[in-house]
């Protein structure tokens, strides 16, 4: 159902081979990002509430592709989740607070998260850290899910099952 | 061809530590998702560790067997994987595999022989 | 965490006959985020590593002889060796990647007649 209005391959808005997107779009594509469809000669990429497309050899269209089907985009783009080990300061944090990368389920706490980002980034401070230096970002706002995950889909259950050491401090919920 | 090569197995007694090293090529490093599988003489595999890639953080996970006592780094400038393994048990004699999750597959090195033994 | 049952756990075929191994999961292993199923089969020989033959549950990897089918979706999969060949003596087993704790089936030993 290529070209189709209602079906599957229906673009929202389509980018040119010729202007791939720029690295603050991917971002936000890494961080909306819920499906993706092949299509005949471009595949379709679910967001949020908006859909987007681009050619199947672009390369940064087979780049959201893998990121997806290794659950290291949409709900599993965890820039916020409770129980890191590791939080580098050179990639901002900015996503659903799950390891989970399917949702068909959104839960009141989910639905916060995709308000505040659409302003703000949210970000956790972490506890025990791994690299060199610690990321620190006081005037945004920080979500503490309290080792709890924020999505249904898969692997959705990873962050409640690391130790308590792990787990960052206590951080203030502000929603404005 | 894509290859993965682990290193820093050996004999250890119960209580100490090893370091294992897994040196990647012949895909992109950075994009894969890491993981160690163990598997002792004669049993099953064994999943035991995950890092994630630097758009999350490298965010890690661990086996509940092996959770407080091993440590998952990468460095992606180097297309290598480290497991720190401290506070080493009997139990976790093994063989000790590097995989590396891509899109195009898993891909797996030949292993390296963990053994505890007093 | 997934439970990866996987049947027969042994399986004598005679050369040339088509040998069938199952798996089974505890929750379905299908991603709506791409419609993909995130199972792999992998065939062992002793004293060698797991080699990756299906991926994607059907997705048969690069040298991988055609006589290796992966099918099913879902929480049901089938791994099948068509004209079963000497070499294709092994351990074989089904693995879940689409959650962590990755976890493995038991395996299927595979025996010559």
């Known amino acids: 159902n290529e070209g189709s209005v209602t079906g599957s391959c229906y673009c929202g808005k389509r980018i040119s081979s010729d202007s791939p997107p720029s690295v603050q779009f991917m971002n936000r594509l890494r961080k909306h990002l819920r499906a993706y469809h092949r299509c005949l000669y471009y595949t379709r990429f679910q967001l949020l509430s908006w859909s987007v497309c681009g050619g199947n050899k672009d390369p940064w269209v087979q780049e959201l592709m893998s990121c997806l089907d290794l659950k290291e985009c949409g709900h599993a783009y965890s820039g916020i989740v409770a129980h890191q080990k590791h939080l580098l300061p050179t990639s901002p944090p900015i996503s659903q607070a799950s390891e989970g990368a399917s949702s068909d389920i959104h839960t009141p706490a989910q639905m916060l998260l995709s308000t505040l980002q659409s302003t703000q980034r949210p970000t956790l401070p972490v506890g025990s850290l791994s690299s060199d230096k610690e990321l620190t970002r006081p005037n945004e706002t920080t979500i503490h899910t309290a080792g709890h995950s924020l999505a249904a889909g898969p692997e959705a259950g990873e962050n409640q099952k690391q130790p308590e050491k792990n787990a960052g401090p206590t951080a203030r919920t502000s929603a404005t | 061809e894509v290859q993965l090569v682990e290193s820093g197995g050996g004999l250890v007694q119960p209580g100490g530590s090893l370091k294992l090293s897994c040196a990647a090529s012949g895909f992109t490093f950075s994009n894969a998702v890491m993981n160690w599988v163990r598997q002792a003489s004669g049993k099953g595999l064994e999943w035991v560790a995950r890092?994630?890639?630097?758009?999350?953080?490298?965010?890690?996970f661990y086996a509940d067997s092996v959770k407080g006592r091993f440590t998952f780094s990468r460095d992606d400038s180097k297309n290598t994987a480290y497991l720190q393994m401290n506070s080493l048990k009997t139990e976790d004699t093994a063989m000790y595999y590097c995989t590396a999750w891509t899109t195009e597959g898993i891909y797996w090195g030949q292993g390296t022989l963990v053994t505890v033994s007093s | 965490d997934i439970v990866m049952t996987q049947s027969p756990s042994s399986l004598a075929v005679s050369l040339g006959e088509t040998a069938t191994i199952n798996c089974k999961s505890s929750?379905?292993?299908?991603?709506?985020?791409?419609?993909?199923?995130?199972l792999a089969w992998y065939q062992q020989k002793p004293g060698q590593p797991p080699k990756l033959l299906i991926y994607?549950?059907?997705t048969r990897q690069s040298g991988v002889p055609d006589r290796f089918t992966g099918s099913g979706a879902g929480t049901d999969f089938t791994l099948t060796i068509s004209s079963v060949q000497a070499e294709d003596l092994a351990i074989y087993y089904c693995q879940q990647y689409y959650d962590t704790p990755w976890t493995f089936g038991g395996g299927t030993k595979v025996e010559i007649k």
């Open positions: 929750q379905s292993l299908l991603y709506s985020g791409n419609q993909k199923n995130y």
């Open positions: 890092i994630r890639t630097k758009p999350n953080n490298y965010a890690t």
């Open positions: 994607w549950a059907s």
